[in-house]
């Protein structure tokens, strides 16, 4: 039950995280105009990964896309790439984890397969979260670097926009959304990996009678099978006696008490 809860919670946390990463990537407020020097401006500038916007006090907002690819700073391109990789990995991870959920039964999928899928999705979520955190952090570092370097008519690291002396940019809402979302995705991934450990098939100690073909007396030893170590290991259980008795692996398996929630 605890395993299912951990897996389910990991999935939900990762889902929220990835939704946040997507939202952050699409948001226009990665950097916002610093109003410290000019708190009474009637024009407010903010910039995203894909376009820059100007909001006039009168309520009109105008946004312009960065219609160049080669003209953009390498750092901005790198941040875009990291965020997109994070989204793609996260989306694949979500897809994999849906099928890996213990509460969802798909055909005769074994627990070992679900454990493998849970681990895979967990790793994907971890990498996705790290990509988002890295992307946001690179952008934040770029902002800090440019903060004191905003000079007239010089291209800076912010989307190639020409900046005049009085306009400086500070952290926008998207950065905080990205950091939190990346963190959630990372936590969700870790939870999936933890859930994977408990998902691996546990060999229950069936007190089943084994019959020897020759009719010789059969040595019976209860509790003789070692439990699997998890993480998808499919180690064959060792026979505890000689002769023609079949191991538990070779006997038709029936659903254990752990198969349903």
């Amino acid at each position: 039950m605890a395993v299912t809860a951990c897996q389910g919670l990991g999935f939900v946390v990762s889902l929220i995280g990835i939704a946040g990463i997507i939202a952050a990537t699409c948001m226009d407020q990665w950097s916002t105009q610093d109003l410290y020097n000019n708190p009474v401006t009637a024009v407010f500038n903010y910039q995203g990964l894909w376009r820059s916007c100007v909001r006039e006090s009168s309520g009109f907002t105008e946004c312009r896309g960065y219609f160049t690819l080669l003209g953009l700073p390498a750092m901005l391109q790198a941040v875009r790439a990291l965020m997109i990789v994070g989204i793609v990995l996260g989306a694949i991870g979500l897809l994999v984890s849906i099928f890996a959920l213990k509460c969802i039964r798909i055909g005769s999928m074994e627990d070992s397969a679900k454990a493998n899928m849970t681990l895979t999705s967990g790793i994907m979520f971890i990498v996705s979260g790290l990509c988002a955190i890295a992307g946001v952090s690179v952008f934040a570092n770029m902002l800090v670097t440019n903060f004191w370097m905003s000079t007239a008519n010089m291209y800076t690291g912010m989307g190639g926009m020409v900046q005049t002396v009085q306009t400086r940019y500070t952290f926008g809402a998207a950065l905080f959304v990205g950091w939190v979302a990346g963190g959630l995705t990372l936590i969700g991934g870790v939870m999936m990996c933890i859930a994977c450990r408990g998902l691996a098939p546990e060999e229950t100690n069936y007190k089943a009678v084994s019959y020897h073909a020759s009719g010789h007396s059969v040595a019976y030893k209860p509790g003789g099978f070692k439990a699997s170590t998890g993480f998808g290991s499919n180690t064959k259980n060792k026979k505890i006696y000689d002769g023609g008795a079949r191991t538990e692996d070779e006997v038709q398996s029936y659903p254990s008490k752990h198969d349903y929630v």
Epitope: Q33, N38, V40, T41, A42, V43, N45, Y46, Q47, S52, C53, V54, E56, S57, S58, G59, F60, E62, R64, M161, V162, Q163, T164, V165, Q166, T167
Partner: antibody
């Protein structure tokens, strides 16, 4: 079409308060800002303050302690209240709608206010 | 506060003449985000409220004749009337729309000879 109309007292005694109402039509006060501008007789324009669509206000630094601008969205009215009037507050008071570029694209006809005892 | 200085204070012209008037601001009105100058020109005829002519320093308001042209950037701006008509006789004001308070210039009065 867009229209703005100011209505004021005409004559106000010194040290009293001035209250002017601007009634608008043809646009929503939740979407557009309304500025107040005054013009003393034979002189230039002086921007007083503005109330934006979201209800936030900005005032001229010289009038910030005496001026208050508010609105009643349901009645499509904007109000100007100027306290502690002096004779140099005598002017024609205009309300105007803010448009693109923060420019004032539509103006009322103005209301003349004289501060005199 | 941004101070707007207009010159000359008055202009005497003849019909059909080309006229230019200047407006200077104490601070740059150029916004880096959209590369637009937040300067507005108004025309005020006697006994009438002001009328919007040009915003963003060079964008004509709809219905304004194309003989009116705004130009300039940063701190120096110009309003040009290519061929003055009798109905153009008025006072012309420039306004800072970039930073509060949204200050006006003292105006340039256009008169006929």
């Amino acid at each position: 079409q867009v229209q703005l109309k100011e209505s004021g007292p005409g004559l106000v005694a010194p040290s009293q308060s001035l209250s002017i109402t601007c009634t608008v039509s043809g646009f929503s006060l939740t979407s557009y800002g309304v500025s107040w501008v005054r013009q003393p007789p034979g002189k230039g324009l002086e921007w007083l303050g503005v109330i934006w669509g979201d209800g936030s206000t900005n005032y001229h630094s010289t009038l910030i302690s005496r001026l208050r601008i508010s609105k009643d969205k349901s009645k499509s009215q904007v109000f100007l209240k100027l306290n502690s009037l002096q004779t140099d507050d005598t002017a024609t008071y205009y309300c105007a709608k803010a448009g693109r570029g923060n420019a004032l694209d539509y103006w009322g006809q103005g209301t003349s206010v004289t501060v005199s005892s | 506060d941004i101070v707007m200085t207009q010159s000359p204070s008055s202009l005497t012209v003849t019909a059909g003449e080309k006229v230019t008037m200047s407006c200077k601001s104490s601070q740059s009105l150029l916004n880096s985000g959209n590369q637009k100058n937040y300067l507005t020109w108004y025309q005020q005829k006697p006994g009438q409220p002001p009328k919007l002519l040009i915003y963003w320093a060079s964008t004509r308001e709809s219905g304004v004749p194309d003989r009116f042209t705004g130009s300039g950037s940063g701190t120096d701006f110009t309003l040009t009337i290519s061929s003055v008509q009798a109905e153009d006789l008025a006072v012309y004001y420039c306004q800072n729309d970039y930073s509060f308070p949204l200050t006006f210039g003292a105006g340039t009065k256009l008169e006929l000879k």
